[in-house]
């Protein structure tokens, strides 16, 4: 059967006026997954995103990540979109004082 991913969005200061947002998916099976950043619901172009490899996490499941740099103050426009085994979810960027949002999807 399939195991849905845990999805976790974090933010970190990049350069002046910019932040890096990272979306991590972990503990999922099978390994096929779509993970992408969207702006206003539209996927960002590939050249503005960085992806990690889909790697085994040691429990028979997998993990991966995608990151992009955005302008501070524009966070509300951006979401991380995940598709796995016919299910999907959307994950917002956490506010500045909250660095971790975990969601398990079934």
């Amino acid at each position: 059967g399939s195991v849905p991913p845990m999805v976790n969005v974090t933010r970190s200061e990049a350069s002046e006026g910019n932040i890096t947002v990272t979306c991590r998916a972990s503990s999922f099976y099978p390994r096929n997954i779509t993970l992408t950043w969207r702006q206003d619901g539209v996927s960002l172009s590939h050249d503005t995103q960085q992806w990690g490899d889909v790697l085994p996490d040691g429990n028979g499941t997998y993990q991966t990540w995608v990151a992009t740099r955005i302008c501070q103050g524009e966070e509300q426009r951006f979401t991380c979109y995940m598709e796995h085994s016919g299910n999907h979810s959307t994950h917002p960027v956490p506010s500045g004082n909250s660095h971790h949002h975990h969601h398990h999807h079934h």
Epitope: D40, S45, Q76, H88, T90
Partner: antibody, heavy 118, light 108 residues
């Protein structure tokens, strides 16, 4: 086949409110944003706002923020646009549209004509 | 707000001729955020070209798009009768999302 089917034409008095619906089918409703756009007679297109039905986030064009409410009912795959304090210049065709993978508006509803007249 | 200015407002051409439509932005936008739509009388707009130069599904190859920065162009290499319509450019780079005022391509 992706379809966005909107409610029928409305005639309203100045000061009244109107609520237009947009029923989506042919795709997973919560996987794409629903945008609202209007077009006054003989005029161009004007973006009103959008909703992300999965998380319920709404972004408005500031020009409309005080008079517009966008909502979505995921159980019926339907989005709604409510416009209050109507005035004659709100007479327009109101369109819903779906966000695409690579563009803001990839599928459109058939439009709903709202006429504001005393 | 990014203002998109389309020119000309009206283009009068005959079938078979080449149409060149311009869209000028009030400030620079990434080519990833510039799209074109076609609208025929009494119909909803239809996505024509996304991200400056990519044809939407079902759009004939006579349509093409180009540009960068503040200047973008939609070209129809040889007009067919069904191409006579209004064309809008749209930017998705910054809020509010905005459209150009449209260029009407009419039969001469």
């Amino acid at each position: 086949e992706v379809q966005l089917v909107q409610s029928g034409a409305e005639v309203k008095k100045p000061g009244a409110s109107v609520k237009v619906s947009c029923k989506a089918s042919g795709y997973a409703f919560t996987s794409n944003n629903i945008y609202w756009v209007r077009q006054a007679p003989g005029q161009g297109l004007e973006w009103i706002g959008y909703i992300d039905p999965y998380i319920g986030r709404i972004i408005y064009n500031q020009q409309f923020k005080d008079r517009v409410t966008i909502t979505a009912d995921t159980s019926t795959s339907t989005a709604y646009l409510e416009l209050s304090s109507l005035r004659s210049e709100d007479t327009a065709v109101y369109y819903c549209s779906r966000s695409g993978e690579r563009s803001n508006f990839d599928y459109w509803g058939q439009g709903t004509l709202v006429t504001v007249s005393s | 707000e990014i203002v998109l200015t389309q020119s000309p407002a009206t283009l009068s051409l005959s079938p078979g001729e080449r149409a060149t439509l311009s869209c000028s932005a009030s400030s620079s936008i990434s080519s990833n955020y510039l799209h074109w739509y076609q609208q025929k009388p009494g119909q909803s707009p239809r996505l024509l070209i996304y991200r400056t130069s990519n044809l939407a599904s079902g759009v004939p190859a006579r349509f093409s798009g180009s540009g960068s920065g503040t200047d973008y162009t939609l070209t129809i290499s040889s007009l067919e009768p069904e191409d006579f319509a209004v064309y809008y450019c749209q930017q998705g780079g910054s809020l509010p999302l905005t459209f150009g005022q449209g260029t009407k391509v009419e039969i001469k």
